[in-house]
């Protein structure tokens, strides 16, 4: 049973590697050559299509057996060597072989441009096993070609070590034009040259281009792909394509927008988005860029107040975030504000000015003019100072706190007063004799605490001394004051 | 009909060489490949390589390489197995099997096997 | 090397069951796998080729599937001359391997 010839026919997705092959019914051998001994290479034809043998790519093997037989010389048939179709056909194709059994080994592989062709799920591969010859025929087939088909396909056999290779079959998909390069979209300068360009490829070739402004034909003779149009300026947005023409027709770009640069719109939505007392925090909308990327931004700050001088303070800032803190500005003070930004073209106008204001601040100086006495009759600390200039104040006083410490014998206490706005002087109990008393005086108004005056010292005696003197607020560089009674 | 014929059983000691024959009978021997397969008592199946019948080129699996020699006699439609310096390991049934076809490596026809006892 | 793994040492069947066999492959062996029954004492005796093609003369209640790494070797209406040893191999690429086997026996 097994020495009958048989035809083995069966689909193998995976290359290289062993054939697929099933024994199946009885057929007379489609080949036929003489028996291995004595064995004289013989005449091979496809057994699809008969046709005459190639010698191109014949392989004689080098392996000798012990007993020196040579094994005879292998070589693919002749096939189609150059299929044209169209885009989304099917193709099929094949290399067939007739390989002596005395091979024993062989595995056949699908390459395309170099590439090995794992995987190929369309190959199938059949064969035809008689007692003396195996018949091989591997079919590629796509059911669907695209572009990226198109090559250079050949079958390897690889036998004994030896690499047997067909024919060379060249695929080669036609169809419209196929853009490698379409025209892109351009912000432009007004007046100003620019280029645009058009690359198309079929097969088949030649490709022509033919450009089209706004509708309307820009070339009266086409040009051969690649096409490189030069506009010498526009004054006015237009849109441009290209249309790629071969013998199977026309293939349309894409149309791109042409803009002209222009100076931006303003900004819109100018908002507040915290206040303190000697900043604000802004953020804005961007108004359209005018083709042109923003550049950098510039924020105008004038004080509202109808008696100042108008005088406007710039601060400039990168485009981005669209975010700026405006600092070094007075504390309860009102500001109008608008923000303008730029791109390569110019300046926008200015945003729609706002109002925004300044909180209350702590007071940025201390009372001055600190004068301590000792009310020895009394039993009493008077304190004597003047209030910190108005725009130091940094909003409307509430009081004062005071701040005396007691130090004797290593003892030392800390004491806070509250003093309402209006005074400006205070009277403290004394809390230790034989003492040294520090005073030091804030202004407060409803932001907060504002820095205490230097130290001002005055020794409180034991009962019974008699002459007391003031003591103040030391000129600047001068050492604590100390009152000795 | 096609039919692989071995050698019989063989007791060897442990340093010994045994040499195994195939004999073919049914076919054109020098039209397919020989090989042999390994399979140790209780054990599965081992490809040890096979043989060029017409150009007597041997293959042989790595852990095969060394002490194994795969041979023929052509005109006796003969192969064999040659087992040099024999270890406990090498105590088996050793199969010759016939490559299918030039395109297929599966095995159509076993022979009924030798079983080699390496004993001290 | 390419790795096959036969997970079913032992398999227990009744007479007239069905049957399934499986064999994973470590990668892509395409459908280049056979199966083959062994019986104590006797060769290996193909039964499938090209992972579904019956070899000649076996009967139609064996069945082969599967391609790439999963393969199946399926028998109907077990009948009591089926228990033996069943190996799968593989032979894409060299060296050709084995299946360790998976033993049929009786519940």
């Known amino acids: 049973a097994i020495t009958e010839a048989r035809e083995e026919a069966k689909p193998y997705p995976l290359f290289p590697g062993p054939f697929p092959g099933s024994l199946q019914t009885d057929h007379t051998p489609l080949l036929s050559l003489p028996h291995a001994s004595g064995y004289q290479p013989a005449l091979m034809f496809s057994p699809t299509q008969p046709g005459r043998p190639h010698t191109g790519n014949v392989a004689i093997p080098q392996v000798t057996s012990v007993e020196s037989k040579p094994l005879p010389p292998l070589a693919f048939k002749h096939t189609v060597g150059h299929i044209i179709l169209s885009e989304h056909k099917g193709v099929k194709f094949n290399c067939s072989i007739s390989v002596p059994n005395i091979y024993q080994d062989t595995t056949i592989s699908w390459w395309k441009d170099g590439k090995e062709l794992l995987g190929a799920h369309h190959a199938i591969t059949q064969f035809y096993p008689d007692d003396e010859v195996t018949a091989i025929i591997a079919s590629f087939s796509i059911t669907s070609v695209q572009r990226s088909d198109n090559g250079s396909y050949i079958c390897k056999m690889k036998i004994n070590n030896e690499e047997i290779v067909s024919d060379p079959i060249y695929i080669e998909v036609q169809g419209l034009p196929h853009f490698t390069k379409q025209p892109e979209s351009m912000n432009v300068t007004r007046n100003t040259a620019f280029n645009l360009t058009c690359q198309a490829v079929g097969p088949p070739e030649p490709v022509n281009i033919f450009w089209v402004q706004n509708s309307s034909r820009v070339n009266e003779q086409p040009e051969k792909s690649p096409s490189v149009l030069t506009v010498p300026g526009l004054t006015e947005m237009a849109v441009f394509s290209c249309e790629a023409h071969n013998d199977k027709g026309l293939t349309v770009s894409k149309g791109v927008q042409i803009n002209i640069k222009a100076i931006p719109s303003p900004p819109t939505e100018v908002s507040i988005r915290n206040s303190t007392a000697h900043s604000i925090l802004i953020s804005w909308v961007p108004g359209f860029d005018g083709y042109s990327p923003f550049r950098n931004c510039s924020i105008q700050v004038k004080e509202a107040d109808p008696l100042s001088n108008g005088s406007v303070m710039i601060f400039n800032t990168s485009a981005l975030p669209h975010l700026y803190q405006i600092k070094q500005l007075q504390a309860l003070a009102n500001y109008s504000i608008g923000v303008s930004c730029m791109n390569e073209i110019g300046w926008s106008a200015v945003s729609p000015w706002i109002l925004a204001s300044t909180t209350e601040g702590a007071p940025s100086v201390a009372p001055l003019n600190v004068t301590v006495f000792l009310n020895e009759s009394s039993d009493n600390v008077d304190i004597r100072w003047m209030k910190p200039p108005t725009k130091q104040q940094d909003g409307e006083l509430v009081g004062y706190r005071i701040s005396h410490v007691w130090q004797s014998a290593g003892i030392s206490k800390e004491l806070l007063e509250e003093v309402g706005q209006n005074g400006s002087r205070a009277r403290i109990s004394v809390q230790v004799h034989n003492a040294t008393c520090t005073v030091r005086i804030a202004a407060v108004t409803r932001g907060g605490v504002g820095p205490f005056s230097d130290p001002v010292k005055i020794f409180i005696p034991a009962h019974g001394w008699v002459d007391y003197a003031p003591s103040s607020t030391p000129a600047p560089g001068n050492a604590d004051p100390v009152l000795i009674i | 009909q096609v039919k692989l014929e071995e050698s019989g059983p063989e007791l060897k000691k442990p340093g010994e060489t045994v040499k195994i024959s195939c004999k073919a009978s049914g076919y054109t021997f020098t039209n397919y490949g020989m090989n042999w397969v390994k399979q140790a008592p209780g054990k599965g199946l081992k490809w040890m390589g096979w043989?060029?019948?017409?150009?007597?080129?041997?293959t042989y699996a790595d852990d095969f390489k060394g002490r194994f020699v795969f041979s023929l006699e052509t005109s006796a439609s003969t192969a064999y197995l040659q087992i040099n310096n024999l270890k406990n390991e090498d105590m088996a049934t050793y199969f010759c099997a016939r490559k299918s076809t030039v395109v297929s490596r599966y095995f159509d026809v076993w022979g009924a096997g030798t079983t080699v006892t390496v004993s001290s | 090397d390419i790795v096959l793994t036969q997970t079913h040492k032992f398999m227990s069947t009744s007479v007239g069951d069905r049957v399934s066999i499986t064999c994973k492959a470590s990668q892509d062996v395409g459908d280049a796998v056979t199966w083959c029954q062994q019986k104590p004492g006797q060769p290996p005796k193909l039964l499938i080729y090209w992972a579904s093609t019956r070899h000649t003369g076996v009967p139609d209640r064996f069945t082969g599937s599967g391609s790439g790494t999963d393969f199946t070797l399926t028998i109907n209406n077990v009948q009591s001359e089926d228990l033996a040893d069943y190996f799968c191999q593989q032979y894409r690429s060299y060296p050709l391997t084995f299946g360790a086997g998976t033993k049929l026996e009786l519940k």
């Open positions: 043989i060029n019948t017409y150009t007597g080129e041997p």
